[in-house]
Interface confidence: medium
C-alpha cells in the first residue's frame, strides 16, 4: 500500500556548494521503508535511497554516496534528509514515499 | 594536518565484544562520513561499514550485519565500532578512514589500524 | 555485489619500468573507482579516486583510466618507494568492494 507524506519544504534556492534541508512528515505509526526520490524534468523519477525503520539503516541506490545524503530524525514523526555539496544536477522536485506492505 | 587514531583493538574470545574507537583531528569532523576498513592478516582489504556526518545513516558489510554496530560522537570528534558476537574470521587490523566524495566515494585519509585477534 | 578482480596478482619490474596493473569490475561501476598503495605495516594511500583524478600530493608518475568495467592503473616509471601492494576498489555501490591486491616487487 503507498501512503502519501507530507514535505513540509515545497521550495528551496541554494548556491552551488552549499547543503539544503528536506523535511518528510510521516502519517501517524508509519512504518516499513520511507523512499526518497528525485524527479528531474524530462527524466523518470530516480530513487536515492531509501529508510528501513525496522533496522534503522539506510540502503544508498548505486552511484549514491553516504556523503551526499544524509538521513536522520526520527521515524515515527519526521525524517529528514540533507542535499550536500550542491550542483546543478542535484536540481528537482525531491519526493518522500512509504509503502507498508 | 588530517589524524586519524584508532584504539581498542585485543584479543577477545570467540562470541565476546570488542569496542574500538578513532579519535579524528585537522577536519571538521562532523562534515565528513566514516567508514571502518579490515584486513585479515596476509589478505587483502575488505569494507566493514560506514557512518554518514550527522551519525544518521549507517551502512554495513553482510558479514557483520546485526554483530557489528558503527556509530560517532561529533562532540567528543570520535568514531566507534561495537563488535558483538565476535567470530575467528574477525581477527583483522580495523582501520578508520575519513571518506570524501566529489564525483564518486573515497578514502582519502586512514589511521594507522589496530588489531583484534578473535581466539580461544 | 560486485566483485573486483585485479590482474596480476604480483609482478616485478626494474626501477624506470613501465608498470600496468588492471582492475575489472563485474559490473559497469561507471568511474566509481578508486586505487590505493599499501606498503607492509602500514595504512593503504590513495593515488587515484574516479578511475583517473590524482590526489593531491600524489606523484605524476600515477596515472589511471577506465571506464565501466575496465580499468588501468600505470606507474609511468616506478621509483625504489613505489615498491608496494596496490587496490582498486569500487564505491558504486554497498558493500564498497577492493581488489584482491597486486604486488609490485623489485626486479
Known amino acids: 500500500k503507498s501512503s502519501n507524506l507530507e514535505g513540509r519544504t515545497k521550495s528551496v534556492i541554494r548556491q552551488t556548494g552549499s547543503s539544503a534541508e528536506i523535511t518528510c512528515d510521516l502519517a501517524e505509526g508509519s512504518t516499513g521503508y520511507i523512499h526518497w526520490y528525485l524527479h528531474q524534468e524530462g527524466k523518470a523519477p530516480q530513487r536515492l535511497l531509501y529508510y528501513d525503520s525496522y533496522t534503522s539503516s539506510v540502503v544508498l541506490e548505486s552511484g549514491i554516496s553516504p556523503g551526499k545524503y544524509d538521513t536522520y530524525g526520527s521515524t515515527r514523526k519526521n525524517l529528514r534528509m540533507i542535499l550536500r555539496n550542491l550542483i546543478e544536477n542535484d536540481s528537482g522536485v525531491y519526493y518522500c514515499a512509504t509503502w507498508d506492505g | 594536518e588530517v589524524q586519524l587514531v584508532e584504539s581498542g583493538g585485543g584479543l577477545v574470545q570467540p562470541g565476546g565484544p570488542l569496542r574500538l574507537s578513532c579519535a579524528a583531528s585537522g577536519f571538521t569532523f562532523s562534515s565528513y562520513a566514516m567508514n571502518w576498513v579490515r584486513q585479515a592478516p596476509g589478505k587483502g582489504l575488505e569494507w566493514v561499514s560506514a557512518i554518514s556526518g550527522s551519525g544518521g545513516s549507517t551502512y554495513y558489510a553482510d558479514s557483520v550485519k546485526g554483530r557489528f554496530t558503527i556509530s560517532r560522537d561529533n562532540s567528543k570528534n570520535t568514531l566507534y565500532l561495537q563488535m558483538n558476537s565476535l567470530r575467528a574470521e574477525d581477527t583483522a587490523v580495523y582501520y578508520c578512514a575519513k571518506a570524501d566524495y566529489g564525483v564518486v566515494y573515497y578514502f582519502d585519509y586512514w589511521g594507522q589500524g589496530t588489531m583484534v585477534t578473535v581466539s580461544s | 555485489d560486485i566483485q573486483m578482480t585485479q590482474s596480476p596478482s604480483s609482478l616485478s619490474a626494474s626501477v624506470g619500468d613501465r608498470v600496468t596493473i588492471t582492475c575489472r569490475a563485474s559490473q559497469s561501476i561507471s568511474t566509481y573507482l578508486n586505487w590505493y598503495q599499501q606498503k607492509p605495516g602500514k595504512a593503504p594511500k590513495l593515488l587515484i579516486y574516479a578511475a583517473s583524478s590524482l590526489q593531491s600530493g600524489v606523484p605524476s608518475r600515477f596515472s589511471g583510466s577506465g571506464s565501466g568495467t575496465d580499468f588501468t592503473l600505470t606507474i609511468s616509471s616506478p621509483q625504489p618507494e613505489d615498491f608496494a601492494t596496490y587496490y582498486c576498489?569500487?564505491?558504486?555501490?554497498?558493500?564498497?568492494?577492493f581488489g584482491q591486491g597486486t604486488k609490485v616487487e623489485i626486479k
Open positions: 576498489q569500487q564505491s558504486y555501490s554497498t558493500p564498497y568492494t
